[in-house]
Amino acid sequence: SEVEYRAEVGQNAYLPCFYTPAAPGNLVPVCWGKGACPVFECGNVVLRTDERDVNYWTSRYWLNGDFRKGDVSLTIENVTLADSGIYCCRIQIPGIMNDEKFNLKLVIKPAKVTPAPTRQRDFTAAFPRMLTTRGHGPAETQTLGSLPDINLTQISTLANELRDSRLANDLRDSGATIRGSSDYKDDDDKHHHHHH
């Protein structure tokens, strides 16, 4: 089943997809499409890379990572509810039926309006059930979804997970392999978003 990612209306959505080039500079063509991965190619292509660069994209879709190192994670700018749905990341490895294909489900939620607290009574008043991570790009703050009441230790653990999981992924894999899909599975309480 698809791995689920969440973002709020008006924010940037981030859909992770990685592979390890066989050698530096040996890039593999990649396509991103709206809709589940078909047998070949991508349906409704929104972005495409080749062995050299990003050679096709549509408005609001771009790669904010180092695609020359195999980080082909998709950023969707300023999302609306209409951006919800399945996205396909396809690593087009040369050879017959060698492609790696991954379906990622994007769930867009209405923007949260969090009233500013009048005074900091306790931790949950100051940080009401929301944790964000910030990327370099404009408006690239995304929520981790609704959390139960949690303490500082748990927040720290979540923040460390966010920071460390990308590094762990980078160290774990080798060869022309995709990573990110099963590694970023959500549970009921946590929605992992990874940023630069």
Epitope: P24, G25, D53, V54, W57, W62, N64, D66
Partner: antibody
Amino acid sequence: QVQLVQSGAEVKKPGASVKVSCKASGYTFTDYYMNWVRQAPGQGLEWIADIIPNNGGSKYNQKFKDRATLTTDTSTSTAYMELRSLRSDDTAVYYCATWGYGSSYRWFDYWGQGTLVTVSS
Amino acid sequence: DIQMTQSPSSLSASVGDRVTITCLASQPIGIWLAWYQQKPGKSPKLLIYAATSLADGVPSRFSGSGSGTDFTFTISSLQPEDIATYYCQQLYSSPWTFGGGTKVEIK
């Protein structure tokens, strides 16, 4: 050490062609794209095209697609850029340059010394 | 093609000053921006690649920041040998395009 050594200055008449060479040494020639960039007198930098010597695959700036041809000779580690139907506004310094990730993902970026091409009647 | 708008086109600063140059891409280019230094009669020299990474042998007073469409190049303490023209270049999608350049002079 890495070196890109270009051919000498050229003076051409309008409508003629010029072929500039760039001899590479100090690295594996076939592993990196060779780019060609030009700079008109007192102006900025303009990318013309690139080529990957291992298979001859190239990409061109649309502006130059009909007039420029890139080739390589892997036996001598030399890249060539030919520009046809020269006009006076083609007067510029032409650079070869190679860049990309090398071993251990260290970025690799080297430029030739430049070749002045003057187009004048 | 992706247009790169660099500003200012020229600036004059004193030795030791902090100098900042900006580069704006017409479309998002992720991290794929490079900064070059060019002295008169010389080939361009790479200073920064992938927006923030310092090229080998480049002094640490040079730095870069940004991603997406907005990028900044900084010389933390201007030195006499930094007199040159500086160019940004996007390496996200070909044709690779350059900014118009910023000429840096000493007051």
